[in-house]
Interface confidence: medium
C-alpha cells in the first residue's frame, strides 16, 4: 500500500506566439481544480475502469478575475497536494491522465459551470520511494507544471511497496546502515546510497552512485547554485585588467542539459537548448511519444510528422480527443431543453439554461414575474421565459427604478425648449412656433401654416 | 459545512396563510436553486417549487399555482415558502432541498423539516 | 407529470439478507435523472442514489441503483439493522418533479 502524489507547480500560457487569454474574465471571475486519474501503464486499458490505480481531485483555487489588458498570467492554484492511494503493489509504469477544470462563478442559473480547460497525458516509469519527478507537459497553448512520486506507507518498503520492513525487538543481524525486514528473518533492506558527498539537500540518486541534482543546482555533488557567478575570487587590486583570479565552475560546467541538450550561459543561470523531442529546463522531459502510451481505451498510436504532435491517436468507436480520452459527445442527444446550452463534463451532462428556465435539462418554466415586483407602478409583462416591467410614464429600467429623462430624446421641435413634468414633458417653443413638441410653425397673421394638401 | 435551518412548527386556521423560513449556511447561496418539498402524514413526499435565490425566479407545481409565493432574502441567506388559504389536506412537514452540488444530481441537502397543522 | 410507482408497497427482510426494491414511470425517465431516497421516522429524506446508479456522498456501497427507461431498481446487497426506513424514488427529468409512493422496508 502506499500513496501517489502530484503537486502542482503552475498553470498558464505556454511559451510562444498564440498564448491563450485568461480562462476568467472581469465579468466572469473563476477559480481552477485539477483531476488525476491513474492507470497501471503495461496493461491494455478497458474503457469500463478508467481509473483502475484510482483518482483524486483537488480543492478548489483561489478565484480569479482577469484585469483587462493584462496578459494572462499562471493562474492561482489550489493548495496541497493530490494524493491518490493505491491498495496494492505500485506497478513501476504507470499512465496518467491530469485534467485542469474551470469553475465559473458567476450568477449564472444553477450555480456553477465547469468546463475542461486542458487535458495532458502521459506514461511513466517510476519506482516507489524515489524523489520528486519534475514534469512539463503541454495541452494546446497551455502549459503544466507539476511533481510526483510514489511513496509507501508503513511499514511497506520496496519499489513496488510489496514488501514489509518494522524494527524488531530482538538485536539486529544485518549489518551497520540496513534495516532488518518481514517477513524474511534474513533478508535486511540496503538504503539506496549516493554517490559519496552528493549534496542530502539538493542531490538525489535513482540508482546507488549517482548524484542528481534539483532545480537551482548543478555541479558533480550539487552543491553549486545555478546562478553562482562564474567568479570564485575576483582578482587582487593590483590587476589592471578585470575576470577571475582562478576560474570557478561556471554554470554550464559540466554540462547541465541532459539528452544532448547544448548549454549556454545566461547573465543569471543558464539555458539549454534541446533536440527535437526534449524540454523542460534541463531538457530532462520528454514530449510524449507513442512510447509513453498516450492513447487511451484503445487507442490506436501514430507516429505524428509534425514535430510538435509527435502522436496521433485513433480512437475506438465511442471514443474521441487527442488522446482518445473522452467518451463520443452524449450532447449530440441533445437533451437540454428550452434552447439551453449542453456540456458533457465526462461524468455527467449539464445544461446551461437560457434566462426564464431552469433545471437540469432547463424543464422549468419559470415564472419570472413571481418575486419580482416593478417598481414605481409598473406592471410585469412574461414572455419567452423572461420578464420585463412595462413601466409608469417617467420610470426606466429593467424594474421601473429609474428615473426617465422625457427630455432626452430631444423631443422639442425647432429649438424649443424641454421640461420634464410629474405627467410627462412641456415644450416651451421658440418664437414663431406651436404645438406640444413646437412642430408647426406661427403665420404671420396668427394661424399656423400648415402645407397645404 | 452546509446547513439548511427551517422555522418552527406553526398552528393555523382554514384559509389562513403559512409562511416558512429555511436559512442556509455553509455555501454561497446564490449559486443553488432551492425547491419546497412537502409530506403529509404517513404519505409520501410532494414536490411544490423551485427558486432561483441569485434571481428569485420561481415556478411552482401546478396544484399550487396561485396559493404558494416563494421568496428569497439574500442578505440573510433565506428563503421563504408563503402558502394562503390553508386548508385541512395542507397539514404537512414542509422541507426545503438544495440542490446538490454535483452536475446531474438532485437534493442533497435537507431542511430539518417543518410541521405545519391545519385546524379549526 | 410523470407518475412513479414503486413496488412492493412493504417488503419484510431480515439482516443479512438481499433487498431489491423496483420503481416504475409512466413514461420514459432519462437515466441520468432518476434518484432514490431513504427516510427515517421523524427526519429528512437522505439522497442514496443519484443519476440511477451513482452514489451520493458517504453512502455505502452495499447500495446500488440500476435501471433505465420506465423501470428502475434500488438493490441493499446485505441488510444491516441501519437499513430498515421507507425508500423513495425520485424523477427530476421533466417539470413537475414526482416521487414514488415509497416502499416501507421492515424486519421480519
Known amino acids: 500500500a502506499g500513496v501517489f502524489e502530484l503537486q502542482i507547480h503552475s498553470f498558464g500560457p505556454g511559451p510562444g506566439p498564440g498564448a491563450p487569454r485568461s480562462p476568467c474574465s472581469a465579468r466572469l471571475p473563476c477559480r481552477l481544480f485539477f483531476r488525476v486519474c491513474l492507470k497501471p501503464g503495461l496493461s491494455e486499458e478497458a474503457a469500463e475502469s478508467p481509473c483502475a490505480l484510482g483518482a483524486a481531485l483537488s480543492a478548489r483555487g483561489p478565484v480569479y478575475t482577469e484585469q483587462p489588458g493584462a496578459p494572462a498570467p499562471d493562474l492561482p492554484l489550489p493548495d496541497g497536494l493530490l494524493q491518490v492511494p493505491f491498495r496494492d503493489a505500485w506497478p513501476g509504469t504507470f499512465s496518467f491522465i491530469i485534467e485542469t477544470w474551470r469553475e465559473e462563478l458567476g450568477d449564472q442559473i444553477g450555480g456553477p459551470a465547469w468546463s475542461l480547460l486542458a487535458r495532458v497525458a502521459g506514461r511513466r516509469r517510476l519506482a516507489a520511494g524515489g524523489p520528486w519527478a519534475r514534469d512539463i507537459q503541454r495541452a494546446g497553448a497551455w502549459e503544466l507544471r507539476f511533481s510526483y512520486r510514489a511513496r509507501c506507507e508503513p511499514p511497506a518498503v520496496g519499489t513496488a511497496c510489496t514488501r514489509l520492513c518494522r524494527p524488531r525487538s530482538a538485536p539486529s543481524r544485518c549489518g551497520p546502515g540496513l534495516r532488518p525486514c518481514a517477513p524474511l528473518e534474513d533478508e535486511c533492506e540496503a538504503p539506496l546510497v549516493c554517490r559519496a558527498g552528493c549534496s542530502p539537500e539538493h542531490g538525489f540518486c535513482e540508482q546507488p552512485g549517482e548524484c542528481r541534482c534539483l532545480e537551482g543546482w548543478t555541479g558533480p555533488l550539487c552543491t553549486v547554485p545555478v546562478s553562482t557567478s562564474s567568479c570564485l575570487s575576483p582578482r587582487g587590486p593590483s590587476s589592471a585588467t578585470t575576470g577571475c583570479l582562478v576560474p570557478g565552475p561556471g554554470p554550464c560546467d559540466g554540462n547541465p542539459c541532459a539528452n544532448g541538450g547544448s548549454c549556454s550561459e545566461t547573465p543569471r543561470s543558464f539555458e539549454c537548448t534541446c533536440p527535437r523531442g526534449f524540454y523542460g529546463l534541463r531538457c530532462e522531459v520528454s514530449g510524449v511519444t507513442c512510447a509513453d502510451g498516450p492513447c487511451f481505451n484503445g487507442g490506436l498510436c501514430v507516429g505524428g510528422a509534425d514535430p510538435d504532435s509527435a502522436y496521433i491517436c485513433h480512437c475506438p468507436p465511442g471514443f474521441q480527443g487527442s488522446n482518445c480520452e473522452k467518451r463520443v459527445d452524449r450532447c449530440s442527444l441533445q437533451p437540454c431543453r428550452n434552447g439551453g446550452l449542453c456540456l458533457d463534463l465526462g461524468h455527467a451532462l449539464r445544461c446551461r439554461c437560457r434566462a426564464g428556465f431552469a433545471g437540469p435539462r432547463c424543464e422549468h418554466d419559470l415564472d419570472d414575474c413571481a418575486g419580482r415586483a416593478c417598481a414605481n407602478g409598473g406592471t410585469c409583462v412574461e414572455g419567452g421565459g423572461a420578464h420585463r416591467c412595462s413601466c409608469a410614464l417617467g420610470f426606466g429600467g429593467r424594474d421601473c427604478r429609474e428615473r426617465a429623462d422625457p427630455c432626452a430624446a430631444r423631443p422639442c421641435a425647432h429649438g424649443g425648449r424641454c421640461y420634464a413634468h410629474f405627467s410627462g414633458l412641456v415644450c416651451a417653443c421658440a418664437p414663431g412656433y406651436m404645438g406640444a413638441r413646437c412642430e408647426f410653425p406661427v403665420h404671420p397673421d396668427g394661424a399656423s401654416a400648415l402645407p397645404a394638401a | 459545512q452546509v446547513q439548511l435551518v427551517q422555522s418552527g412548527a406553526e398552528v393555523k386556521k382554514p384559509g389562513a396563510s403559512v409562511k416558512v423560513s429555511c436559512k442556509a449556511s455553509?455555501?454561497?447561496?446564490?449559486?443553488?436553486?432551492m425547491h419546497w418539498v412537502r409530506q403529509a402524514p404517513g404519505q409520501g413526499l410532494e414536490w411544490m417549487g423551485i427558486?432561483?435565490?441569485?434571481?428569485?425566479?420561481?415556478s411552482y407545481a401546478q396544484k399550487f399555482q396561485g396559493r404558494v409565493t416563494m421568496t428569497r432574502d439574500t442578505s440573510t441567506s433565506t428563503v421563504y415558502m408563503e402558502l394562503s388559504s390553508l386548508r385541512s389536506e395542507d397539514t404537512a412537514v414542509y422541507y426545503c432541498a438544495r440542490v446538490a452540488d454535483i452536475v446531474g444530481a438532485t437534493f442533497d441537502y435537507w431542511g430539518q423539516g417543518t410541521l405545519v397543522t391545519v385546524s379549526s | 407529470e410523470i407518475v412513479l410507482t414503486q413496488s412492493p408497497g412493504t417488503l419484510s427482510l431480515s439482516p443479512g439478507e438481499r433487498a431489491t426494491l423496483s420503481c416504475r414511470a409512466s413514461?420514459?425517465?432519462?437515466?441520468?435523472?432518476l434518484a432514490w431516497y431513504q427516510q427515517k421516522p421523524g427526519q429528512a429524506p437522505r439522497l442514496l442514489i443519484y443519476g440511477a446508479s451513482s452514489w451520493a456522498t458517504g453512502i455505502p456501497d452495499r447500495f446500488s441503483g440500476s435501471g433505465s427507461g420506465t423501470d428502475f431498481t434500488l438493490t441493499i446487497s446485505r441488510l444491516e439493522p441501519e437499513d430498515f426506513a421507507v425508500y423513495y424514488c425520485?424523477?427530476?427529468?421533466?417539470?413537475?418533479?414526482?416521487f414514488g409512493q415509497g416502499t416501507k422496508l421492515e424486519i421480519k
Open positions: 425520485q424523477q427530476y427529468d421533466s417539470s413537475p418533479y414526482t
Open positions: 455553509g455555501y454561497t447561496f446564490t449559486s443553488y436553486y
Open positions: 413514461q420514459s425517465v432519462s437515466s441520468s435523472y
Open positions: 427558486i432561483n435565490p441569485s434571481g428569485g425566479s420561481t
